[in-house]
């Protein structure tokens, strides 16, 4: 059985407004005060197990004491009354949990969706945090008759029992209750047809057309309520690899249908398309986006033709030279489908041509030291691009009329080129470039560009400390122009290693040291200059710096019989490297001198 | 590789008749033109005939025209010298060649870069 307790709390079960003021009372019993030899001053109130200051109670009678709190800020504090029996013996008298918290707001945003096929869901801002337990019930009635309550489990929505009646309108309100009050939301008023959100469109499916390769048909399922409802449709769609949406202007997907038609788009190129629906008249909700589908638009004729160049080899003796004709692959966005070949047309005058289907890119034709016009178009299974002309000129004629002022500089990690046009009009520009070494071949890479660029970035994949050759010629209609060249840098970097240093000739007091030009696959960088350190096994150190045109210099002032150190570094726009040392001793006596 | 070979020579008397066969292959684009050079012994390697191998324009010596005539077979990658009114001086050693140069057909040995092992032409009286 139960001990009974020897006084209690009141009030039992405290609720307080945060940052109010409250007052607790506990009364011990008679029979406990006459048991214990107590009264209400050996009352010890406690919060959560701290004793609460004296200046908190007041002794009220021999029976009672009061314990007041001010701006009560704690979620929930354990309030115990306790007595001090025996002068010592701490004995509890009662307990109680104290909370405090907030009455609830007046709930706000009250707006209902009707998911189709599922019973229809409302939800709402409650306000702040209350931090006590309080009850929201989700309430709606038509004009004549009440429906079931809505009990909410999280206090933010609830879902009705029962299913919507559409074209009839319903009011709904929330009322929000708890231990500090009670309040309703303004209620909303509407059909719940015009809270519909449909279940997205299905069954998505993206054709092309042979006869447009600029266009793609769409065609899908909506349900909107089994055909209740009549729906718009919201299309977008983008290239598979963009990761941006374009959107159809809402107002050409107005009207309820099921099929639509994607103009402007770009021939054989990869669309990915989504589609979402609501109810014609706007109101309600968008259902989520479908399925993504994906089709490709139909093959359209190579838009431009190839980038087109050519080059020369020796000629066999006399009579013929061999010429290889080389073209770029046309980008995708270009080639407007799958290029199958080129079609290459030689012609030395109007009864003489030679025509080549090639499927590379590249053709090796043997000519005669006439002049020959190629022309190149690419083919795919539309058609065939327009021809870029190349007039091949005969070796005889000297090319005139080249760029000027050409520069090149790193830029954004590229390496741009430009220059100032010739004075006669260019049909178009032809770039090569490839890395300087001696340890290897110049591999050449090119790219042209159009007759009104003069300034452009290689469009390789260049590689940083390596000495790039670049060559500009521009081309007429007549052949090519004279090219002009220069050597670049996409990065520099310090040398990998420095000059070695040797002397040429040694005197009493002076001598000619001599070194090779760093190896271009060292250089790393242009080498700007020069400094030789050169000192005594007890002198100072000095230090001359010379321009890097040079590969000699003489040291002068020197002191005779003397064992010189010498150390020479090459220094590019990114730092310094030294070369190994090396030692000389000059001579005692000058050449023809006597001790 | 390229190949070229020839047949069709042989002995026949003044003013008979032979048929030459050159069958060419190899090629990854076709010749722009082929010909039939002939070689006396001590003497250089004269032109007789070329034919293009696209249209069909045909070349002669002065020596053999209205005697020779220059065909091809495009579906059997063969061409043929036919060979009427043979004279004493048209014995020697004829060659089949073939040239990518790109220009107007011609009976220039300097134009041709693929030649055959050649076949014996003899006419006695």
């Known amino acids: 059985q139960l001990l009974e307790p020897c006084g209690y709390i009141y009030p039992e079960f405290p609720v307080v407004q945060r940052g109010s003021n409250f007052t607790a009372i506990c009364v011990l019993k008679e029979a406990c005060l006459q048991h214990y030899y107590v009264n209400a001053s050996y009352i010890v109130w406690k919060t959560n197990h701290a004793a609460v200051p004296r200046e908190q109670v007041t002794v009220i009678n021999r029976t009672t004491s009061s314990v007041t709190f001010t701006d009560v800020v704690l979620p929930s504090v354990q309030l115990t009354c306790n007595i001090l029996s025996f002068g010592q013996i701490e004995q509890n008298v009662y307990g109680v949990t104290m909370l405090s918290g907030f009455p609830p707001d007046k709930p706000t945003n009250l707006t209902c969706i009707v998911n189709e096929g599922k019973n229809m869901l409302c939800q709402w801002d409650p306000g702040r945090e209350t931090y006590l337990e309080t009850n929201y019930t989700l309430k709606s009635e038509w004009a004549t008759e009440k429906f079931p309550d809505c009990q909410s489990k999280h206090g933010t929505s609830c879902m009705v029992s029962y299913m919507p009646t559409y074209y009839v309108n319903i009011e709904v309100w929330v009322e929000a209750e708890n231990a500090l009050g009670k309040v309703s939301s303004e209620s909303i008023n509407f059909d719940p047809v015009d809270k519909v959100k449909p279940t997205p469109p299905y069954n998505l499916s993206v054709t092309n057309s042979e006869e447009l390769s600029s266009i793609l048909k769409l065609s899908w399922v909506s349900s909107g309520l089994g055909g209740l409802l009549d729906l718009k449709s919201d299309i977008q769609y983008r290239t598979k690899d963009a990761s941006t949406w374009i959107q159809v202007p809402l107002e050409d997907t107005m009207s309820p249908r099921t099929s639509f038609t994607v103009q402007d788009l770009k021939p054989f190129t990869e669309y990915v398309f989504r589609i979402r629906s609501i109810k014609d008249s706007g109101k309600g909700y968008w259902s989520d986006w479908s399925e993504e589908a994906s089709g490709t638009t139909y093959e359209d004729r190579p838009s431009r033709p190839p980038s087109f160049w050519y080059k020369t080899n020796p000629s066999h003796g006399q009579e013929y030279r061999s010429v290889r004709l080389i073209w770029k692959a046309l980008p995708l966005s270009e080639a407007n489908g799958k290029i199958l070949d080129y079609e290459v047309i030689l012609t030395q005058s109007k009864s003489v041509s030679q025509t080549y289907t090639v499927t590379g890119t590249e053709l090796t034709v043997n000519l005669t030291n006439d002049r020959y016009v190629a022309s190149l178009a690419a083919r795919n299974k539309v058609g065939k691009s327009a021809a870029a002309v190349l007039t091949i000129p005969s070796p005889h004629v000297t090319a005139a009329y080249s760029v000027v002022n050409l520069k090149a500089f790193p830029k954004d990690n590229l390496l741009w080129v430009e220059w100032t046009p010739p004075p006669k009009p260019v049909s178009k520009y032809i770039l090569e470039w490839c890395v300087l070494s001696e340890n290897a071949p110049c591999v050449e890479d090119w790219q042209q560009e159009d007759a009104t660029v003069n300034r452009t970035h290689l469009r390789g994949r260049l590689l940083e400390s390596k000495c790039y050759q670049i060559t500009v010629t521009p081309v007429f209609a007549t052949g090519p122009g004279g090219s002009e060249s220069l050597k670049a840098y996409l990065k520099q970097a310090a040398p990998a290693r420095g000059p070695t240093v040797r002397t040429k000739k040694v005197g009493k007091n002076e001598a000619v040291l001599a070194w090779d030009q760093i190896p271009v696959d060292d250089q790393n960088g242009f080498i700007r200059n020069y400094s030789i350190s050169y000192r005594t096994s007890v002198g100072k150190e000095m230090v001359v710096h010379v321009d890097s045109s040079h590969t000699e210099y003489t040291l002068s002032s020197l002191s005779s019989d003397t064992l010189y150190m010498v150390r020479m570094a090459a220094y590019t726009d990114e730092g310094g490297k030294d070369g190994p040392e090396f030692t000389f001793t000059t001579p005692k006596f000058a050449q023809g001198e006597i001790e | 590789q390229v190949q070229l070979q020839e047949s069709g020579g042989g002995s026949v008397q003044a003013g008979g008749s032979l048929r030459l066969s050159c069958v060419i292959s190899?090629?990854?684009?076709?010749?722009?033109?082929m010909g039939w050079f002939r070689q006396v012994l001590g003497k250089e390697r004269e032109g007789v005939a070329a034919?293009?191998?696209?249209?069909?324009?045909?070349v002669y010596a002065d020596s053999v025209k209205g005697r020779f005539t220059i065909s091809q077979d495009s579906s059997k990658n063969t061409v043929y010298l036919e060979m009427n009114g043979l004279k004493l001086e048209d014995t020697g050693m004829y060659y089949c060649?073939?040239?990518?140069?790109?220009?107007?057909?011609?009976?220039?040995?300097?134009?041709?870069?693929?030649w055959g092992q050649g076949t014996q032409v003899t006419v006695s009286s």
């Open positions: 060649a073939a040239t990518t140069v790109i220009t107007s057909v011609s009976i220039n040995r300097n134009l041709y870069q693929y």
């Open positions: 190899g090629f990854t684009y076709r010749p722009t033109f």
């Open positions: 034919i293009t191998t696209g249209g069909g324009s045909t």
